[in-house]
């Protein structure tokens, strides 16, 4: 598999990390998060060329199927492979809590 | 999040599990694979409109966040939840060896 | 850049209360929550508690509930802590600390030393 | 509430040495860790979150590691300037709690 930062469409153009600056209201969280009022929220986007960061046996057959049956068969999918936790501050019947979601941001990013 | 048949786009249209049959030629493996002669490929297919089988909360904001900035943000992509093993019959220097591959077909498909 | 200032020291008699104020600066006041921790002379630290400052909504440890008052003046940009019916064992500094995430503190004010002393 | 336990109490390094600060939750916190450095006469600084997150400005010569109840914070070559004492945080469940620090002194 290609090197992560090797992107044969150009760089910065592959599946990578970007950062989206979102708010509660953006989020449709507005009405039950306190904290924090904005959140970075880090996904993955970009395109999965041939093998580029190519997760497991099935993003490589996908690839191969895809380059074979391109109506049929998507290219791969930029995911994350990982996440990174995040506390959010949230409205409560008595008050508010704390609670960590441990599935809300992309730590790093895979083709699937 | 919409039940996992409930397509909102019209049966079938929705991310779900397709089965492609794929030879070793198709894969490019037939110089290191010698069984099975063809294999069928289950993969995840479909598109994944708001809330669908969405994986986890990273998949809610990428649909609140892709409503808002289409351009930036890609819609949640339909991949692999879990993946059922296979074993393959493969050519080594001294003969053949039987590999199981824990990666290679999806079992079920979730939006992310 | 983000900062926080806090006022200055405070010398008390057992009973009384104290007010210690936090001014921010360098981003959006309401888009950080601010939390309240001490440090005893000699030990460690001790988180009091939290405030929201877009609408005041705070959580206390419950240790100082009842004693301890979280509020913000939003238009001042300045969030403060008042502690009653002082004891000698609340001299400490209080430090205002500003967070991003709720879960850890990323920036903190100065130090306010309270002394409680008859 | 969660106590957090930190050791040693004191530790005394030679600067290039490595340096391992542990601290022990009372039940699991997952990862919800946090590791501050805090000089005399200063406010603390926040050094690694989430038990083995990097933050901007930090040396790369601190480190954080662990989960659930033991957890790790490692100076692989200590320098004059981190001498100070070290304080575990977690954020697993209000109230916060801190640990009674570790003190790192330069030989």
């Known amino acids: 598999a290609r090197n992560g930062d090797d992107c044969p469409l150009g760089p910065g153009r592959c599946c990578r990390l970007h950062t989206v600056r979102a708010s509660l209201e953006d989020l449709g969280w507005a009405d039950w998060v306190l904290s924090p009022r904005e959140v970075q929220v880090t996904m993955c986007i970009g395109a999965c060329p041939s093998q580029f960061r190519a997760a497991n046996m099935h993003a490589q057959i996908k690839t191969s199927l895809h380059r074979l049956k391109p109506d049929t068969v998507p290219a791969p999918c930029c995911v994350p492979a990982s996440y990174n936790p995040m506390v959010l501050i949230q409205k409560t019947d008595t008050g508010v809590s704390l609670q960590t979601y441990d599935d809300l941001l992309a730590k790093d990013c895979h083709c699937i | 999040a919409r039940n996992g048949d409930d397509c909102p786009l019209g049966p079938g249209r929705c991310c779900r599990l397709h089965t492609v049959r794929a030879s070793l030629e198709d894969l490019g493996w037939a110089d290191w694979v010698l069984s099975p002669r063809e294999v069928q490929v289950t993969m995840c297919i479909g598109a994944c409109p708001s809330q669908f089988r969405a994986a986890n909360m990273h998949a809610q904001i990428k649909t609140s966040l892709h409503r808002l900035k289409p351009d930036t943000v890609p819609a949640p992509c339909c991949v692999p939840a879990s993946y059922n093993p296979m074993v393959l019959i493969q050519k080594t220097d001294t003969g053949v060896s039987l590999q199981t591959y824990d990666d290679l077909l999806a079992k079920d498909c979730h939006c992310i | 850049q983000v900062q926080l200032v806090q006022s200055g020291s405070e010398l008390k008699k057992p009973g009384a209360s104290v007010k210690v104020s936090c001014k921010a600066s360098?981003?959006?006041?309401?888009?950080?929550?601010i939390n309240w921790v001490r440090q005893a002379p000699g030990q460690g630290l001790e988180w009091i508690g939290w405030?929201?400052?877009?609408?005041?909504?705070?959580k206390y440890n419950e240790k100082f509930k009842g004693r301890a008052t979280l509020t913000v003046d939003t238009s001042a940009s300045t969030a403060y802590m008042e502690l009653s019916s002082l004891r000698s064992e609340d001299t400490a500094v209080y430090y205002c600390?500003?967070?991003?995430?709720?879960?850890?503190?990323?920036?903190w004010g100065q130090g306010t030393t309270v002394t409680v002393s008859s | 509430e969660i106590v957090l336990t930190q050791s040693p109490a004191t530790l005394s390094v030679s600067p290039g040495e490595r340096a391992t600060l542990s601290c022990r939750a009372s039940?699991?916190?997952?990862?919800?860790l946090h590791w501050y450095q805090q000089k005399p006469g200063q406010a603390p600084r926040l050094l690694i979150k989430?038990?083995?997150q990097s933050i901007s400005g930090v040396p790369d010569r601190f480190s954080g590691s662990g989960s659930g109840t033991d957890f790790t914070l490692k100076i692989s070559r200590v320098e004059a300037e981190d001498f100070g004492v070290y304080y575990c945080?977690?954020?697993?469940?209000?109230?916060?709690?801190f640990g009674g620090g570790t003190k790192v002194e330069i030989k």
């Open positions: 989430y038990a083995s």
């Open positions: 945080q977690q954020s697993n469940s209000w109230p916060y709690t």
């Open positions: 360098g981003y959006t006041f309401t888009s950080y929550d």
């Open positions: 039940q699991s916190i997952s990862y919800y």
């Open positions: 600390a500003g967070t991003y995430d709720p879960a850890y503190f990323d920036y």
């Open positions: 405030i929201y400052p877009r609408d005041g909504i705070s």
